[in-house]
């Protein structure tokens, strides 16, 4: 009876959409890399479903993912990072769907941090600086950053600036006087690796000076 029930489960499983997406993070914990996968459909019943990666691994043929609520996760030093791996959704020994992926093409950098803005009165500008853990990494060192800022009252009116360094100067005359601004930054691999935008850094808030009426400049 139990065998019949399992067969029925398998037939039901084959009707579902098991499409998934993954991202890798290299040297995320010392020399350890991570790989995170999740189903595109949040309503998929993940009971009894497992993820497995095979190929382009060091010393082992395959590795199983750990399940953390609705995501599947591996942290390991065993990714060769050369060539394609096969990532499969499995129920028991049966593969439901698989994708061949080079882990160096699905890299999601860590979010930038320590974002700050300093106003320079003499220069009439704002110096934006932030930090990234990728400066110390062996592999994903070259990133493109996206700095986004908006006046706090403008809900969806973000201005974006792309840059490869971790320092940006905003001219005071380009900003509204006596206004509160929100600013944040994210990163994406640039050169040698491909992938996705990082999460946004925590936002930083700063206020622009008021206009000095006698000179027409901001205070």
């Amino acid at each position: 009876e139990s065998g019949y029930a399992q067969n029925g489960d398998l037939e039901d499983a084959e009707l579902d959409d098991y499409s998934f997406s993954c991202y890798s993070q290299l040297e995320v914990n010392g020399s350890q890399h991570s790989l995170t996968c999740a189903f595109e459909d949040p309503d998929v019943n993940t009971t009894n479903l497992e993820f497995e990666i095979c190929g382009a691994l060091v010393e082992v043929k395959c590795l199983n993912f750990r399940k953390l609520q609705e995501i599947y996760f591996i942290e390991t030093k065993k990714f060769l990072l050369i060539g394609k791996s096969n990532i499969c959704v499995k129920v028991g020994e049966k593969s439901l769907t698989c994708k061949k992926i080079d882990l160096t093409t699905i890299v999601k950098p860590e979010a930038p941090f320590d974002l700050s803005v300093i106003y320079r009165e003499g220069a009439n500008d704002f110096v934006v600086t932030f930090n990234t853990s990728h400066l110390q990494k062996k592999y994903v060192k070259v990133l493109m950053h996206d700095v986004a800022y908006r006046q706090e009252k403008d809900e969806n009116k973000w201005t974006h600036v792309n840059l490869s360094s971790t320092k940006l100067t905003l001219l005071q005359r380009k900003l509204q006087p006596a206004a509160m601004y929100e600013i944040k930054v994210r990163s994406i691999p640039d050169h040698y690796f491909k992938g996705f935008w990082s999460e946004w850094s925590p936002s930083y808030y700063f206020r622009t000076p008021e206009i000095n009426n006698s000179s027409g400049e901001m205070d």
């Epitope: 043929k61 050369i82 060539g83 394609k84 061949k100």
Partner: nanobody
């Protein structure tokens, strides 16, 4: 029809250097992993070095680490193997391979002969 062509082999004295090239006519070269192997007389083919699609990641066997350097030029569809401090045991036929897909190399060249004399 010919897809991978190795060149640069020859006779060299122990301690000398050679640079092998492998030209690919495979359209996906710039997104494929590449590797070098050798087969010594009477022995199985052995892995020497591999390189990721962009050149950022490389991997070497213990036998050539520190002496051989793998590199690639995606604009020229060409793979290289710089071999320094050559030893007599480096003698053999050198093959390049392309597209490392789930632990199987999909394409192989015909090889180029390297002979190291002592």
């Amino acid at each position: 029809e010919v897809q991978l062509v190795e060149s640069g082999g020859g006779l060299v004295q122990a301690g000398g250097s050679l640079r092998l090239s492998c030209e690919s006519s495979i359209s996906t070269f710039s997104s494929d992993a590449m590797g070098w192997f050798r087969q010594a007389p009477g022995k199985e083919r052995e892995f020497l070095a591999a390189i990721g699609w962009s050149g950022a990641v490389t991997h070497y066997s213990d036998s050539v680490q520190g002496r051989f350097t793998i590199s690639r030029d995606n604009a020229k569809n060409t793979l290289y193997l710089q071999m320094n401090s050559l030893k007599s045991e480096d003698t053999g036929r050198y093959y390049c391979a392309e597209d490392y897909d789930t632990d199987v190399w999909q394409y192989w060249g015909q090889g180029t002969q390297v002979t190291v004399s002592s």
